[in-house]
């Protein structure tokens, strides 16, 4: 998997003529249509409600730091998080909640109730996802909060819990 | 949030040479790669099965009118709707349904059953989403229908119920 | 619905000057920003865990063969599958599972438990989706596996069960 950032951003390239002026492939490779994306899987060992992620996932034009995706190029981003829960039902219902935070503020949340029958069962699977389309500035942080993080099964389902962002439209 | 339309669409710009011919940034800013998108939150007060939306959300190259997103540029669109339900369980199961309509025709729906134990409980959360990838023409309408709209909690969860579209590929 | 592939790919076009050099629309239509996408609905009659799809859906720059989407252009793809289940509850809970496979390897799965009360009910609806962002090479296959395929309701919900991919960023 590539984990490259964007060392040679179009911003660093002189955009006028020169030897490139007639070479359309050259021209278009220098085009101001930046693309940035990330696709990270949850860290193996979770010990707090703010989720941590494996930084060896796909990172391109986005940084990862202390549980946060950090935006490097401003624009309109599509953000999506998907989590796989495995709940050993107690004798009451359980509310699973996924919060998407932008700069430590709650931007969007998803909730689902499981174990609603109130019966102690072997296990119940639940999948929960949340998406967001939002303008993000440089250094904006994107993070995920899950109160019931103990129900995120990172051992059986290490690939199922992901946070992904991609730039849809830059703000040039 | 920006709610700009596209007053200076590339269609209105002469695409031949002139003073712009050597300025690559100028050339590429006039490129025929339109982008259109919308991200609207549900209106506070719902009183019918066809959902209404807050028109002060993100709208770019898409219009909002009478519960409909109205397409302004033809192309292949990604459409996604996500709803957060809060159900005060009666003593029977409840089927929650989300319908995506294109030009008033049901194009795709999602259903989930809650309160299946038949026990009257305090409340049950359920999150439901639906997506679509489709070619849309100019003036095509996109709308959402929910039979059980009374269970959409717009007061506690005003940000959780959204309809979003974005143009993936225009039809040039 | 259009089901065109890409007969005149930019790769086959000489990208230097000529009569096109001053015509920016012409230049940009030859740009190396390939787009590939697919949106297929599940086949009417399912008889095995590997799902089959209607090949008369939307296919552009992607082939369909024997239950697989076959990638024709390398790059970073967004892959999403959504399934609508209708379960006649037995007297035990049922685990529904959706697996996304890349080259016959399980890349990501989603699970949800229904009928958890253990009561035999008339029916229970459940909607399950799964997404993936991944680099795919030419001839990579994308497929979907569902252990409980008998619960996918293709008659009542022929449009609700879909597999979709689209190229986010090519690997030029």
């Amino acid at each position: 998997q590539r984990t490259d950032s964007i060392p040679n951003s179009p911003d660093n390239i002189p955009l006028r003529g020169g030897n490139c002026s007639e070479d359309l492939l050259c021209i278009l490779k220098r085009a101001p249509f930046k693309k940035s994306w990330a696709y990270l899987q949850v860290a193996k060992h979770l010990n707090k409600t703010k989720l941590s992620w494996n930084k060896d996932g796909i990172l391109h034009g986005v940084r990862y730091q202390d549980g946060n995706l950090v935006i490097q190029f401003p624009g309109l981003y599509f953000i999506i998080c998907q989590l796989q829960f495995l709940v050993q039902c107690p004798n009451n219902s359980v509310d699973l909640k996924l919060e998407l935070l932008i700069n430590k503020h709650i931007k969007k949340q998803a909730l689902v109730t499981v174990c609603e029958s109130g019966m102690q069962t072997k296990h119940v699977y639940q999948n929960l996802s949340q998406f967001l389309l939002d303008y993000l500035q440089v250094n904006t942080t994107v993070s995920v909060n899950v109160d019931t993080f103990q129900y995120i099964d990172t051992s059986t389902f290490p690939l199922e819990n992901v946070l992904s962002v991609f730039l849809y439209s830059n703000s040039d | 949030q920006r709610t700009d339309s596209i007053p200076n669409s590339p269609d209105n710009i002469p695409l031949r040479g002139g003073n712009c011919s050597e300025d690559l940034l100028c050339i590429l800013k006039r490129a025929p790669f339109k982008k259109s998108w919308a991200y609207l939150q549900v209106a506070k007060h719902l009183n019918k099965t066809k959902l209404s939306w807050n028109k002060d959300g993100i709208l770019h190259g898409v219009r909002y009118q009478d519960g409909n997103l109205v397409i302004q540029f033809p192309g292949l669109y990604f459409i996604i709707c996500q709803l957060q339900f809060l159900v005060q369980c009666p003593n029977n199961s409840v089927d929650l349904k989300l319908e995506l309509l294109i030009n008033k025709h049901i194009k795709k729906q999602a259903l989930v059953t809650v309160c299946e134990s038949g026990m009257q409980t305090k409340h049950v959360y359920q999150n439901l989403s639906q997506f679509l990838l489709d070619y849309l023409q100019v003036n095509t309408t996109v709308s959402v229908n929910v039979d059980t709209f009374q269970y959409i909690d717009t007061s506690t969860f005003p940000l959780e119920n959204v309809l979003s579209v974005f143009l993936y590929s225009n039809s040039d | 619905q259009r089901t065109d592939s890409i007969p005149n790919s930019p790769d086959n076009i000489p990208l230097r000057g000529g009569n096109c050099s001053e015509d920016l629309l012409c230049i940009l239509k030859r740009a190396p920003f390939k787009k590939s996408w697919a949106y297929l609905q599940v086949a009417k009659h399912l008889n095995k865990t590997k799902l089959s799809w209607n090949k008369d859906g939307i296919l552009h720059g992607v082939r369909y063969q024997d239950g697989n989407l076959v990638i024709q252009f390398p790059g970073l793809y967004f892959i999403i599958c959504q399934l609508q289940f209708l379960v006649q509850c037995p007297n035990n809970s049922v685990d529904l599972k959706l697996e996304l496979l890349i080259n016959k390897h399980i890349k990501k799965q989603a699970l949800v438990t229904v009928c958890e009360s253990g009561m035999q009910t008339k029916h229970v609806y459940q909607n399950l989706s799964q997404f993936l962002l991944d680099y795919l090479q030419v001839n990579t296959t994308v497929s979907v596996n569902v252990d409980t395929f008998q619960y996918i309701d293709t008659s009542t919900f022929p449009l609700e069960n879909v597999l979709s991919v689209f190229l986010y960023s090519n690997s030029d």
């Epitope: 703010k50 935070l101 | 940000l159 | -």
Partner: antibody, heavy 124, light 110 residues
């Protein structure tokens, strides 16, 4: 201007249930979280829980098994029940309003309106 | 949920600045920018002074300001005045959709 007034018995016997009501005047009860907070004499504030007009509740985990809150929008009132009380539940009980606004994100404006408090003593 | 940690007391002379700290965990103060500060005079109900870390409600003096770093929030009062003498409580929203208060700090104006 919104005002809150707590009411209920000032004395409750151990093992019984403490019941308090808060009446909201000068404004609507809709679109806010309504909160109960207590303060034992000479000690700090303790958050008990909150209820939204939709009926959604959040309770302090340490009190959750004993707390029930309800809201009556027609009377502009909300109430607190605390079961199986002991002397440790003796305190001044405040009802209060918490303002949360969902706009471009969730804005938490804190507890901006308080009742004057009512003293509840648990004793036999 | 454990109470947030505040110093039991702080003091300062009129005109000086003082800072009250409030230490929590990664599930409250460290997680959200949802920290509030309250002032309570003897035998009175508390009054909201700061919300969302550093925002003042209308009517609150701009001598009051807040900040947040890691798992610790702070309230700073500049140009200390006699009427600032009171108890101060921090409060943070938590990951379980609840609120938690600090133990309180008694401010003495010398």
């Amino acid at each position: 201007q919104v005002q809150l007034q707590e009411s209920g018995p000032g004395l409750v016997k151990p093992s019984e249930t403490l019941s308090l009501t808060c009446t909201v005047s000068g404004g609507s009860i809709s679109s806010y979280y309504w909160t109960w907070i207590r303060q034992p004499a000479g000690k700090g504030l303790e958050w008990i829980g909150r209820i939204y007009t939709s009926g959604i509740t959040n309770y302090n985990p340490s009190l959750k098994s004993r707390v029930t809150m309800s809201v009556d929008t027609s009377k502009n009132q909300f109430s607190l029940k605390l079961s199986s009380v002991t002397a440790a539940d003796t305190a001044v009980y405040y009802c209060a309003r918490e303002r949360v606004v969902g706009a471009s994100r969730y804005y938490y404006y804190g507890v901006d309106v308080w009742g004057q408090g009512t003293t509840v003593t648990v004793s036999s | 949920q454990s109470a947030l940690t505040q110093p039991a007391s702080v003091s300062g002379s009129p005109g000086q600045s003082i800072t009250i700290s409030c230490t929590g965990t990664s599930s409250d103060v460290g997680l959200y920018n949802y920290v509030s500060w309250y002032q309570q005079h003897p035998d009175k109900a508390p009054k909201l002074m700061i919300f969302e870390v550093n925002n003042r409600p209308s009517g609150v003096s701009n001598r009051f300001s807040g900040s947040n770093s890691g798992n610790t929030a702070s309230l700073t009062i500049s140009g200390l005045q006699a009427e600032d003498e009171a108890d101060y409580y921090c409060s943070s929203y938590t990951s379980s959709s609840t609120w938690v208060f600090g133990g309180g700090t008694k401010l003495t104006v010398l």
